[in-house]
């Protein structure tokens, strides 16, 4: 579990003005430091889906990346705990599932991961900028929260192809553009010298394309990894709203687990006995670095270029932390 | 440039709730990661939380002090993130920022390589 360690603070830079190279070096052992220190630091995904073959209908999937065991998961919609959201569904690992309309199936997928298939008309039925929020109540973590809400630039009447790279950072651009002169002038050279010895030179194409292929794979993720990790949106209406469902369901206590099924009652050897549907083996999912699982054989990812807030094309694979396989 | 204004901010009552919110302006497409800090009076920048989006997936941690107590959202299409602030104790009382983070950054790592940073709002918890 983290610890606070004392990190020297850093004023805001003024805009435009990076902090000079000595600077970073001074602040780097701090920073290992640190990493050291919060390496268990507990991480909530949440993933939110249209699905294509049915309209209006949300597959919302939600993870703890995290060393404790989950006791209680619950799933919200119309915004976190405090800010106005509702209960979807509740999920304890040994006293069963209770789900509440508009959501139609919910069930652990492992013993730290939930999905929840919701699907409305009219008034009970979600939007496209819906928030969704899955609480997980952990021991020893504790409660943690997490939002997430559709893409916006998910248009179902688009297929997209796989999201291209970014544009180039500047300074990695600069990086790039010596290497290449470097690279030409070699190759230049060689052709000269091929011309000279009047013999044919060796085969140049994997060292001209060699010191940039890593770079590049860092940057994109592959159509497979991509393929694997989306699924086809649906056009959803336009008109909903979460439905106040406070009065359906009580909040107070544990009481309403009494209604669930007996056999829900001891605790199962796997996640599969805890919800009331079952869950697809474990080979069909593919395990992914940072515990995301995702059906494998779906088509690649409905986000065109027109992505407004932070998109990060590199795919859920990066800038995770330490996230053991499960 | 990216622009990050904060608000929200004010005074609450302890064990009240606050909700902050950050928009972003400018060029935005170019960040993929959004994180909260906050100073104390006298004390250090410390991490508060982050936010990561990925296609379809959203990816959130928080400092250990956070315990539950806040909620850490965004909203893609109006460019705009919140922290939802429940349970406040005296000691959250500080000045809060928003912080657009580079696509490689570890959010573990406290302040350290923050590329662009709002001016902060106050937020006092009185007991």
């Known amino acids: 579990m983290r610890t606070e360690a004392q990190v020297p603070a850093l004023q805001p830079p003024e805009p435009g003005l990076e902090g000079a190279m000595g600077h970073r070096t001074l602040v780097l052992p701090w920073v290992l430091l640190t990493l050291c220190v919060t390496a268990g630091t507990p991480e909530v995904w949440v993933q939110v889906r249209m699905e294509a073959t049915e309209l209006s209908s949300f597959t919302i999937r939600c993870g703890f990346l995290g060393s404790g065991s989950i006791s209680l998961v619950t799933v919200s919609w119309g915004g976190p705990n405090g800010a106005g959201g509702t209960t979807l569904a509740v999920l304890h690992p040994e006293r069963g599932i209770r789900q509440w309309a508009p959501a139609r199936q919910a069930r652990w997928e492992t013993q730290s991961s939930i999905s929840l298939i919701l699907e409305g008309s009219g008034a009970s039925s979600p939007c496209a900028n819906t928030t969704f929020c899955c609480k997980f109540a952990s021991f020893p973590e504790g409660s943690w929260e997490a939002c997430g809400s559709l893409p916006p630039s998910s248009d179902p009447g688009l297929s997209a192809p796989p999201t291209p790279a970014p544009i180039l950072r500047a300074d990695l651009a600069g990086i790039l553009g010596v290497s290449g002169v470097l690279l030409f002038g070699c190759v230049y050279l060689l052709h000269l010298l091929r011309r000279h010895k009047h013999r044919p030179a060796p085969r140049l194409q994997p060292s001209r394309t060699s010191p940039q292929a890593p770079r590049a794979r860092a940057w994109a993720p592959s159509q497979a990894s991509q393929a694997a990790l989306h699924v086809p949106y649906a056009t959803i209406n336009t008109s909903c709203r979460p439905a106040t469902l406070d009065t359906a369901h009580p909040h107070g206590g544990p009481s309403w687990w009494a209604s669930l099924p007996t056999h829900a009652a001891h605790r199962p050897q796997g996640p599969a006995a805890w919800a009331s549907t079952p869950i697809p083996a474990r080979g069909s999912f593919v395990s992914v670095e940072n515990g995301l699982y995702a059906q494998a054989g779906e088509r690649p990812p409905h986000t065109g270029p027109g992505l407004t807030l932070f998109p990060d094309p590199r795919g859920p694979r990066a800038m995770e932390g330490p996230l053991g396989v499960r | 440039q990216l622009q990050l204004v904060e608000s929200g901010g004010g005074l609450v009552q302890s064990g009240g709730s606050l909700r902050l919110s950050c928009a972003a302006s400018g060029r935005t497409r170019s960040m993929y990661v959004m994180g909260w800090f906050r100073q104390a009076p006298g004390k250090e920048r410390e991490f508060v939380g982050r936010?990561?989006?990925?296609?379809?997936?959203?990816?959130?941690s928080y400092a250990d002090f956070v315990k539950g107590r806040f909620t850490l959202y965004g909203n893609q299409a109006r460019n705009t993130v919140y922290l939802q602030m429940n349970s406040l104790k005296p000691e959250d009382t500080a000045v809060y920022y928003c912080?657009?983070?580079?696509?490689?950054?570890?959010?573990?790592?406290?302040?350290?390589?923050?590329?662009?940073w709002g001016k902060g709002t106050l937020v006092t918890v009185s007991s």
């Open positions: 936010i990561k989006w990925s296609g379809d997936t959203t990816y959130t």
């Open positions: 912080a657009a983070l580079p696509s490689d950054y570890d959010y573990r790592a406290a302040s350290y390589g923050v590329d662009y």
